[in-house]
Interface confidence: low
């Protein structure tokens, strides 16, 4: 807390300008009117204040707005945003996407800090859902943002927002998250033709069920191995050798390199060896010829 001291004669600030960088902390406290600061916040960012001086300016705003800053001030906080605590931010009511963008810009290139996480949380809760424009903005600044949400939070993403999602935004999503996102993507892209649809849906296929993979195998999509390896094991297991061959197209030879890894490893164990041999890849570990193949799905459902 800065002591209350009288402003020296002639030092009362009439404007927020560069002359203030020469003020000591106590002079800033005594000579800068909080209301003036609030109306000229846009100037603060252009002035090279020290961290200590920014602390004083924050203190003045906190005194002026004990219940939380108005959006007109928040939008122009600039580097002063980095001084805010999550507790400060929880008092705010941020409704403008422009305000959100301005504050995210300040933190650009850094990890998502607790302050930013709180800001985003407040903004999204205020809007009621993750609309397309918000998602577009958040993933532009934080490509991993979508995958940092719980499956429950993702369920509030409307299908229309899926158009804003880029493949790299899904890099760190786990299967449970893709389980939620995939049906939304399927709905969002349902009116596209075959090849265009596959390009868009590809990144979400880690959440696709068996029947959708079977349908894709009939459409000459030529899925690459990187995508195939991200598919749900339980969705891949029921696929026949012929279906996998159609699904992968020319990429089918890549199965050999992946034969020790899930889901390929587990899929091989469920196939007849003579069916695997038709691929000509030397895949081993299938069910020997002449053995009875039980339908394990019912057994698994009962266990």
């Amino acid at each position: 807390e800065v002591e209350k001291t009288a402003c020296p004669s002639g030092k009362k600030a009439r404007e927020i300008d560069e002359s203030l960088i020469f003020y000591k902390k106590w002079e800033l406290e005594a000579c800068v009117d909080a209301a003036l600061l609030a109306t000229q916040m846009d100037r603060v960012n252009a002035i090279p204040f020290t961290y200590e001086q920014l602390d004083v300016l924050k203190h003045k705003l906190d005194e002026l707005y004990p219940q939380g800053y108005p959006e007109s001030v928040i939008q122009h906080l600039g580097y002063l945003f980095l001084k805010m605590s999550p507790e400060d931010i929880r008092k705010w009511n941020v409704t403008s996407l422009e305000t959100l963008k301005a504050l995210l810009e300040v933190n650009k290139g850094h990890e998502m800090s607790p302050q930013v996480a709180t800001l985003i949380d407040r903004f999204v809760k205020g809007r009621g859902q993750l609309d397309k424009d918000t998602l577009d903005t958040l993933t532009a600044f934080y490509p991993g943002y979508l995958c940092s949400l719980s499956p429950e939070e993702l369920s509030s993403v409307p299908p229309s927002s899926i158009w804003a999602v880029r493949p790299q935004d899904l890099d760190t999503c786990d299967p449970r998250q893709l389980d939620v996102l995939y049906p939304k993507a399927r709905l969002a892209f349902q009116n596209m033709n075959g090849s265009e649809y596959f390009v868009k849906i590809q990144s979400f296929l880690g959440g696709a069920p068996t029947e959708d993979l079977k349908a894709l195998s009939q459409q000459n999509v030529s899925m690459d191995l990187a995508t195939f390896m991200k598919l749900r094991t339980d969705a891949v297991l029921p696929l026949t050798v012929a279906e996998v061959q159609k699904l992968l197209g020319p990429h089918v030879e890549g199965l050999k390199a992946e034969e020790r890894h899930r889901p390929v490893r587990d899929w091989i164990l469920r196939q007849r060896q003579d069916d695997l041999d038709t691929l000509g890849l030397g895949l081993q570990g299938g069910i020997p010829n002449g053995y009875l193949v039980l339908d394990l799905s019912m057994q698994e459902a009962l266990s």
Epitope: E111, M112, P114, A117, G144, S148, Q168, D171, T172, D174, P175, R176, A226, M229, K230
Partner: antibody
Framework: QVQLVESGGGLVQPGGSLRLSCAAS????????MHWVRQVPGKGLVWVSR????????TYADSVEGRFTISRDNAKNTLYLQMNSLRDDDTAVYYC???????WGQGTTVTVSS | DIQMTQSPSTLSASVGDRVTITCRAS??????LAWYQQKPGKAPKLLIY???SLESGVPSRFSGSGSGTEFTLTISSLQPDDFAVYYC??????????FGQGTKVEIK
């Protein structure tokens, strides 16, 4: 400040076990995927394993699959690597990595030798 | 599995030199490549991610470029603090992450 501190390394006989720990501070541990990377002294970096934010998804390098187990305790801000059936070629400095690969620990040395 | 090959293995240079290190991927990884710097006895430090994005706090003399299978790390004017080992790392073919074998930048 943002920090990862590994512990639990040491000398162990082939076939033995060790449990490495990595204590995180200064960032929201529960928001990030975490990794273990190892390095034989004088050699290159080798990725070992990763775990997602809530611990439900884990992945391993072929060389350690079935022997090593990665886990995390978000309440304690700690990452673990349980290493069983250790072999001579597991001897290395083990690094804990997080924060989208921007945050690395100082490393802990594991020596497997009879 | 995807292979990452760095060249040269060792590079002798002087302070002020422009230095370029190359990293080749055995298959396309789009722009999913990172560069790290490691000094003796220390942990690696992230310099560049997404092929060309400079990590916060890293001097602007470091830059990255490339896409697909060919990538380069450039140090525009080598400083005394830059003598170290540099590694590339792919994260375009998850779930596996692969590092290059490293390039040692030493004093000429």
């Amino acid at each position: 400040q943002v920090q990862l501190v590994e512990s639990g390394g040491g000398l162990v006989q082939p076939g033995g076990s060790l449990r490495l720990s990595c204590a995180a501070s200064g960032f929201t541990f529960s928001s990030y995927w975490m990794h273990w990377v190892r390095q034989v002294p004088g050699k290159g970096l080798v990725w070992v394993s990763r775990i997602n934010t809530d611990g439900s998804t884990t992945t391993y390098a072929d060389s350690v699959e079935g022997r090593f187990t990665i886990s995390r305790d978000n309440a304690k801000n700690t990452l673990y690597l349980q290493m069983n059936s250790l072999r001579d070629d597991d001897t290395a400095v083990y690094y804990c990595v997080g924060g989208h690969w921007a945050v690395w620990g100082q490393g802990t040395t594991v020596t497997v030798s009879s | 599995d995807i292979q990452m090959t760095q060249s040269p293995s060792t590079l002798s240079a002087s302070v002020g030199d422009r230095v370029t290190i190359t990293c080749r991927a055995s298959q396309s990884i789009s722009d999913r490549l990172a560069w790290y710097q490691q000094k003796p006895g220390k942990a690696p430090k992230l310099l560049i991610y997404k092929a060309s994005s400079l990590e916060s706090g890293v001097p602007s003399r470091f830059s990255g470029s490339g896409s697909g299978t060919e990538f380069t790390l450039t140090i525009s004017s080598l400083q005394p603090d830059d003598f170290a080992v540099y590694y590339c790392q792919q994260y375009g073919h998850l779930p596996m992450y692969t590092f290059g074998q490293g390039t040692k930048v030493e004093i000429k």
